[in-house]
């Protein structure tokens, strides 16, 4: 129950990629506004996105303080123009979000192949170490900085002229693979956190092929 002209938010959903984290919900407001609160399991509630008509709230600044914590958010509904009004229980209507642990649940963003360099019959493929919004000592940490060895990359590669795909993995952001001289190869990479139970893999990177500008060839 609540005031006659407000409805509780529903379908509260965390949308998070590389720790950029937004809480979304429904419905689109009609004569009402929302305020979001976020808390760790043991912490105090902090209000964000005050009296907004949006149905999303960027909570990145809060969750990056400790990405290994588990967070809970709640969305309060208020009548537009009368935000002091409360429900029959003496407080505004609200709905809780599912719990969210960024380190375990944030989606891995699509990686990018930074470069590849051929030297003879070997190709060194380097994956860009994407910057996140997680900070330490006033600097932004990269994905590798945050996840360490929990993060691996899988390389898919194949001859330009065939469909047979090979794979390799690495615990760094580099691969060094054997290729046939005189053949052009194409590459795609995927970020993986093997220890996870959900959101283990990113989407594949865009395909990069030898003979294009990202590559370099040396005898």
């Amino acid at each position: 129950s609540g005031t006659t002209n407000t409805v509780a938010a529903y379908n509260l959903t965390w949308k998070s990629t590389n720790f950029k984290t937004i809480l979304e919900w429904e419905p689109k407001p009609v004569n009402q506004v929302y305020t979001v609160q976020i808390s760790t399991k043991s912490g105090d509630w902090k209000s964000k996105c005050f009296y907004t008509t949006d149905t999303e709230c960027d909570l990145t600044d809060e969750i990056v303080k400790d990405v290994k914590q588990t967070y809970l958010a709640r969305v309060f509904s208020y009548p537009a123009g009368n935000v002091e009004s409360t429900g029959s229980a003496g407080e505004p209507l609200y709905e809780n979000s599912p719990e969210f642990t960024p380190y375990l649940e944030t989606n891995l963003g699509q990686p990018t192949i930074q470069s590849f360099e051929q030297v003879g019959t070997k190709v060194n493929v380097t994956v860009e170490d994407e910057r996140t919004l997680v900070r330490r000592n006033n600097t932004f940490l990269s994905l590798r900085d945050v996840f360490g060895k929990d993060l691996i990359y899988t390389l898919y590669y194949w001859k330009d002229s065939s469909t047979g795909r090979k794979t390799n993995t690495t615990h760094t952001n580099e691969f060094l693979i054997d290729v046939d001289k005189g053949e052009n190869y194409c590459f795609s990479v995927q970020a993986v956190i093997p220890s996870r139970t959900v959101n283990r893999k990113s989407t594949d990177s865009p395909v990069e092929c030898m003979g294009q500008e990202k590559g370099e060839f040396r005898e």
């Epitope: 330490r136 940490l141 990269s142 590798r144 900085d145 945050v146 996840f147 360490g148 060895k149 929990d150 390389l155 390799n168 993995t169 690495t170 615990h171 760094t172 580099e174 691969f175 060094l176 693979i177 054997d178 220890s195």
Partner: antibody, heavy 125, light 108 residues
């Protein structure tokens, strides 16, 4: 070449916190390796305690996780181990080690290739 | 956790003989993550083999590693006096990283 040196008290009282520091010389702690702590009980095998990256990213042995904190100080080129609520069962030689990437089969994997000499810690009242 | 069982516990051999040390895992281990270490009394362990079969720089070619899945082997083709020590296998693919209980190679 890189060398590691453990330091800290050799005697700790039961229920107190064991604190050790590993100083890295001959290389930067921020150069893409991981830094580990391993212990060896008297006359026994090796037990991995945990590791840290220069960014502060850590992994711990679940059997010790509730009592262990590993931290890094890049300005001093050091990393540290704290083990709380110690008992006689924590008496051991404690080693720090570098976990460095080695090329294998198309990718790079980490192995503990440089170790400190080890420091003996006895837990006793 | 992955349990590594080494056998035999002690191997008594003479210099010049061949030593075969076994390491069996409780579940499959990707060979990329399998290493062998040597430890002498009063010293820290030393990395010998990584990736199950690749010798670390400076390790003599009398040391060789093999195996995959759950069964791995360290072979010392001709024992030198300095090879008498304790040998540990280790997996670094799954947390917690674990070591075998060790095989002591002693002079017969």
């Amino acid at each position: 070449q890189v060398q590691l040196q453990e330091s800290g008290p050799g005697l700790v009282k039961p229920s107190q916190t064991l604190s050790l520091t590993c100083t890295v010389s001959g290389g930067s702690i921020s150069s893409g390796q991981y830094w580990s702590w391993i212990r060896q009980h008297p006359g026994k095998g090796l037990e991995w305690i945990g590791e840290i990256y220069y960014s502060g990213s850590t992994r711990y042995n679940p059997s010790l996780k509730s009592r262990v904190t590993i931290s890094v100080d890049t300005s001093k080129n050091q990393f540290s181990l704290k083990l709380s609520s110690v008992t006689a069962a924590d008496t051991a030689v404690y080693y720090c080690a570098r976990d460095a990437p080695y090329y294998y089969g198309g990718g790079y994997y980490y192995y503990m290739d440089v170790w400190g000499k080890g420091t003996t810690v006895t837990v006793s009242s | 956790e992955i349990v590594l069982t080494q056998s035999p516990g002690t191997l008594s051999l003479s210099p010049g003989e061949r030593a075969t040390l076994s390491c069996r895992a409780s579940e499959s281990v990707d060979s990329s993550y399998l290493a062998w270490y040597q430890q002498k009394p009063g010293q820290a362990p030393r990395l010998l083999i990584y990736g199950a079969s690749t010798r670390q720089t400076g390790i003599p070619d009398r040391f060789s590693g093999s195996g995959s899945g759950t069964d791995f082997t360290l072979t010392i083709s001709r024992l030198e006096p300095e090879d008498f020590a304790v040998y540990y296998c280790q997996q670094a693919g799954v947390v917690p990283y674990t070591f075998g209980g060790g095989t002591k190679v002693e002079i017969k």
